[in-house]
Interface confidence: medium
Amino acid sequence: QTLGGVNECQDTTTCPAYATCTDTTDSYYCTCKRGFLSSNGQTNFQGPGVECQDVNECLQSDSPCGPNSVCTNILGRAKCSCLRGFSSSTGKDWILGSLDNFLCADVDECLTIGICPKYSNCSNSVGSYSCTCQPGFVLNGSICEDEDECVTRDVCPEHATCHNTLGSYYCTCNSGLESSGGGPMFQGLDESCEDVDECSRNSTLCGPTFICINTLGSYSCSCPAGFSLPTFQILGHPADGNCTDIDECDDTCPLNSSCTNTIGSYFCTCHPGFASSNGQLNFKDLEVTCEDIDECTQDPLQCGLNSVCTNVPGSYICGCLPDFQMDPEGSQGYGNFNCKRILFKCKEDLILQSEQIQQCQAVQGRDLGYASFCTLVNATFTILDNTCENKSAPVSLQSAATSVSLVLEQATTWFELSKEETSTLGTILLETVESTMLAALLIPSGNASQMIQTEYLDIESKVINEECKENESINLAARGDKMNVGCFIIKESVSTGAPGVAFVSFAHMESVLNERFFEDGQSFRKLRMNSRVVGGTVTGEKKEDFSKPIIYTLQHIQPKQKSERPICVSWNTDVEDGRWTPSGCEIVEASETHTVCSCNRMANLAIIMASGELTME
């Protein structure tokens, strides 16, 4: 610059920002700093209007900072950073083009303590890493947990026990077995658990007189065939002892048999009442069993007539049908069981017939809402008690009839009862009257042929003393009702002592044991009771299936309408607690005032009128 010339570079505004000013002899020039470029493209420039603009060095080449790096442009220069998973040699960023020019190298994260969870292996990869659970562990969230191989996989062979351990497992053979590999513990299915043949391994195990028997997991010592000593399980040598000859009958034969020991053998025989399953009388086969003989099925008449046969193991028990009892005279020897009809029923015979009656005998029955029913039952039983108290003492039919009247007279109480209670009580009352009439005929007090009349029942009974010709008949009447019995009945009924018949007619009983107790298959018919309830009985064994009929003439309570058809019904105790059924009787004739019934048995009867049979309502 000439002496006295101006130094333009002293003025800081001569050159733009980011430029350096250089003074020359006669002038100056501006140069953009490194990382900047003049707006007019000249390296050296003068004058206003030219700016130094930042150069984006990051765009000057594809990878200005090198591989695995990020270039960031900053004013006048560029900053280099390594990608995640990579690092410079200093671990820091650097300025592009500076002396500290680095390369980004992969970081081995596996060198960082605790980067992977416990019981996992760390694998480094370029720019990353991965954690893998060690064998025997499984990933659960972010931790490696023990895998229970015993549960998750089939890892041990048959006859082995699996034991899970932390990170592993082991197998042990079950007691008395050993692994094919010979070790106490093993892994996997390559080895198997095999039985140790202790007998082959040690021939002296059972001593000289015993036979060694190998079993799965153990062994036992046993005597040769035909000799015995209690078999025992052994750990060492057998106890001192000798094998002695066997009595084969010791626990050899099946249940319900006896054993006969023979020289060198034996045989079994079933006990009486049992038969061998192979049909042989004497047998040895261990598979044979002695089975009970069902004597009742084998012979339906095993116990005789009117009996019940019950099979029991090895035998059978005989009992009698209802209304029958064992005949002590005819039941002396085995197979001579005999049942004879009960002459007349007592309280004990009736109690068995109904659960409701049994309730009355227990105190609680009287407190369970059966009070009215039980009062009438007990009143009826009192009559029977008087009859049965002393079976050889004379029975007063008059006093019994009076007592029955007292029960019948409690009509209001009867109507409080349920249907079942009514039919049960009706049955008891009818059977009590029959028993009392029979007792009066069998053990008469004075004249056994008598007529009793009370407000509620009339009875006529006759003892047939004089010779009664077979073609003749006996007539009995009570109120307006009659019973005609042929003399044949004397022979057929098999009476002990003088034969007798009795007939009873009940007043008002038809209103209690009414048509609702008739099981009618034709629901469209209208039914009504139209006679008193009557009953006939005869002394002796037989009460039914007579060769000739018994004729009952029953008086209608109201005249029979033309549209009505009478049904002769008898009281049947086999149906529920007692029901009217039409079986066993048929109508001989019916007038406006009477119906004549012909029946093959002694029974309690009544007439039910049915109307509207042809008209469907």
Epitope: K118, Y119, N140, E145, H163, N164, T165, L166, G167
Partner: antibody
């Protein structure tokens, strides 16, 4: 901090049952909960453990049928019911948080159970 | 089941001394053994797991060693608060089993 709070002492009659509780706090209720019996004669005996997340249980065979382990995740509480109690069941019962590697990093204070006629 | 035999049954020592407690397993349990401290009125405390790993918050004077069947708990320079009952426990397989305990008493 991790805390295990156990129910109070119990005096019960032979033949009856008792249900002990263990309330966990201070951590996420996911770790196995173990139960341990301590008697003077037998020392410490591991009864079994339950996984609160799944309800899965593992029992010591000596306590199968005697102890029943359950959890209520909503209240972070573990329960152990002991049935058909006899005087031999008289002991202190601890609940203990299980690490996934089967050791116990936190214990409850214990519940004394006395079985007496 | 793995039987754990602990010895000695009783141990008497003075503060400042070093003591060792042994635990023997009836079969190999690898490194999976834990040690616990039991003191009256306090919750049981885990000291060591996996044979030698110190539980966080436990002073470094406690150390564990051993693997397979034989293990040792060593307490260097005993402090007054170290006295109490010590139990070992195998955490290698179910059922988890404990040693019979060692009572460490102050002389």
């Amino acid at each position: 901090q991790v805390q295990l709070q156990q129910s109070g002492a119990e005096l019960v009659k032979p033949g009856t049952s008792v249900k002990l509780s263990c309330k966990a706090s201070g951590y996420t209720f996911t770790n196995h909960m173990n139960w341990v019996k301590q008697t003077t004669g037998q020392g410490l005996e591991w009864i079994g453990r339950i996984n609160p997340g799944t309800g899965g249980t593992s029992y010591n065979v000596n306590f199968k049928g005697k102890a029943t382990l359950t959890v209520d995740e909503s209240s972070s509480t573990a329960f152990m019911q002991l049935s058909s109690l006899t005087p031999e069941d008289s002991a202190v019962y601890y609940c203990a948080r299980g690490d996934s590697y089967w050791y116990f990093d936190f214990w409850g204070p214990g519940t004394m159970v006395t079985v007496s006629g | 089941d793995v039987q754990m035999t602990q010895s000695p049954y009783n141990l008497v020592a003075s503060p400042g001394e070093s003591v060792s407690i042994n635990c023997k397993a009836s079969k190999s349990i690898s490194k999976y053994l834990a040690w616990y401290q039991q003191k009256p009125g306090k919750a049981n405390k885990l000291l060591i797991y996996e044979g030698s790993t110190l539980q966080s918050g436990i002073p470094s004077r406690f150390s564990g060693s051993g693997s397979g069947t034989d293990f040792t708990l060593t307490i260097r320079s005993l402090e007054p608060e170290d006295f109490g009952l010590y139990y070992c426990q195998q955490h290698n397989e179910y059922p988890l089993t404990f040693g019979s305990g060692t009572k460490l008493e102050i002389k």
